[in-house]
């Protein structure tokens, strides 16, 4: 029982993840205009993987799509991979693992099989969220980076009347939902993997047998049979658990924020 | 068609108070940013205030700052202008703008209302 | 604050002769993010509520005669009315759209020769 509750919550722990990643891969904040030196802004700017925006105060916002490829920063570029190879390597971890819920019955599938799925499905999760993270770890590193420039930037050659007000960037709402999102997607995976622990065929000790030869009194002790302790089929502990298929219905839709007028 | 109509002008004495309204329609009023823009009899244009559709953001010129307090009722459709400690400087034609345009830009403009601060 | 400083102060110009406006910023009113410059002019004509001419330093608002053009980035901006009709006499105003307070200048006054 506790395995599939381990298994099941791995589950909805890895789903809510990966909505994240893919919804943080989506968004356009990801690096936001430092209101510091200009609190008082009509203009705001911000920019995501795919595009960047600007929010005037009448309400209007205005989005640009990055229409270059080879014009782009290697490090954006990267950061874009490593989120695709996260949501690509969740969702197929999302559907081997639907078949490895204990709750859900395929065929004479055994429970060795499940355990490899599993396991399989956990450490796509792990490494979905590592990539998450490292795609969102590099991009804030790239934002610090640029931040300290910028900022030095703006305190030298300022002898003239004339002030330019640089636009520097900070942390978007997007890199706190990567964050948090790889994050669940990884302790996902973990439980994933723990579970599968469970799930593999328990060694089986079968109790010492004796066989009364008909004249002699000799007894057969066959020593304590092991079974494998791999993942190959164990039918002696075959169980079937008809527990009925969940759907997911209730996975959120991310709406945009941004209103055009 | 866009229509601001503002009223609750008039002859006030210094150190006194008025309140300003702004009856907006022919747009979707909570949609969008307000402004209050005052000119002096013979002198030039001078933002007063602005106010953002939900209320979240609001600023003031330096000149009305503690002074002036901008409102609004979306399901009213109107925008307001509480002036409080009036001066005779104050004295001017109040009206009241949308940034209903790209570029923050002041696209639509009522025909004003007229202050008077003196004693 | 923005300080917009606009001249002249006032303009007389012959029937189809250029009239120039010009608007300068003590601060840039160029935004990074998409490339434009805030800056809007306006037309006020006598006893009338000011209309809005062109956004963005540049882009005519429709409607707008394309006599009226606008230039300039950064801090130094003009508006240039190619062929002055009876019709365009009014007071030009320039405004800081960028940042609060979103100051005008101080308008310039556009008369006939």
């Known amino acids: 029982m506790a395995v599939t509750a381990c298994q099941g919550l791995g589950f909805v722990v890895s789903l809510i993840g990966i909505a994240g990643i893919i919804a943080a891969t989506c968004m356009d904040q990801w690096s936001t205009q430092d209101l510091y030196n200009n609190p008082v802004t009509a203009v705001f700017n911000y920019q995501g993987l795919w595009r960047s925006c600007v929010r005037e105060s009448s309400g209007f916002t205005e989005c640009r799509g990055y229409f270059t490829l080879l014009g782009l920063p290697a490090m954006l570029q990267a950061v874009r991979a490593l989120m695709i190879v996260g949501i690509v390597l969740g969702a197929i971890g999302l559907l081997v693992s639907i078949f490895a819920l204990k709750c859900i019955r395929i065929g004479s599938m055994e429970d060795s099989a499940k355990a490899n799925m599993t396991l399989t499905s956990g450490i796509m999760f792990i490494v979905s969220g590592l990539c998450a993270i490292a795609g969102v770890s590099v991009f804030a590193n790239m934002l610090v980076t640029n931040f300290w420039m910028s900022t030095a930037n703006m305190y030298t050659g300022m002898g003239g009347m004339v002030q330019t007000v640089q636009t520097r960037y900070t942390f978007g709402a997007a890199l706190f939902v990567g964050w948090v999102a790889g994050g669940l997607t990884l302790i996902g995976g973990v439980m994933m993997c723990i579970a599968c622990r469970g799930l593999a065929p328990e060694e089986t000790n079968y109790k010492a047998v004796s066989y009364h030869a008909s004249g002699h009194s000799v007894a057969y002790k066959p020593g304590g049979f092991k079974a494998s302790t791999g993942f190959g089929s164990n039918t002696k502990n075959k169980k079937i658990y008809d527990g009925g298929a969940r759907t997911e219905d209730e996975v959120q839709s991310y709406p945009s924020k941004h209103d055009y007028v | 068609e866009v229509q601001l109509v503002e009223s609750g002008g008039g002859l006030v004495q210094p150190g006194g108070s008025l309140r300003l309204s702004c009856a907006a329609s022919g747009f979707t009023f909570s949609s969008f940013g307000m402004h209050w823009v005052r000119q002096a009899p013979g002198k030039g244009l001078e933002w007063v205030a602005y106010?953002?559709?939900?209320?979240?953001?609001?600023y003031y010129a330096d000149t009305v700052k503690g002074r002036f307090t901008i409102s609004r009722d979306n399901p009213k459709n109107s925008l307001y202008l509480q002036m409080n400690s009036l001066r005779a400087e104050d004295t001017a034609v109040y009206y009241c703008?949308?940034?209903?345009?790209?570029?923050?830009?002041?696209?639509?403009w009522g025909q004003g209302t007229t202050v008077t601060v003196s004693s | 604050d923005v300080v917009l400083t606009q001249s002249p102060d006032s303009l007389a110009v012959s029937l189809g002769e250029r009239a120039t406006i010009s608007c300068k910023s003590s601060q840039s009113l160029f935004n990074v993010g998409n490339q434009k410059n805030y800056l809007t002019w306006y037309q006020q004509k006598p006893g009338q509520t000011p209309t809005l001419l062109i956004y963005w330093a540049s882009t005519r608002k429709s409607g707008v005669p394309d006599r009226f053009s606008g230039s300039g980035s950064g801090t130094d901006f003009t508006l240039t009315i190619s062929s002055l009709q009876a019709e365009d006499v009014a007071v030009y105003y320039c405004?800081?759209?960028?940042?609060?307070?979103?100051?005008f200048g101080g308008g310039t006054k556009v008369e006939i020769k």
């Open positions: 405004q800081n759209v960028y940042s609060y307070p979103l100051t």
């Open positions: 703008a949308t940034s209903y345009y790209y570029g923050n830009a002041l696209e639509y």
């Open positions: 106010i953002s559709s939900g209320s979240g953001s609001i």
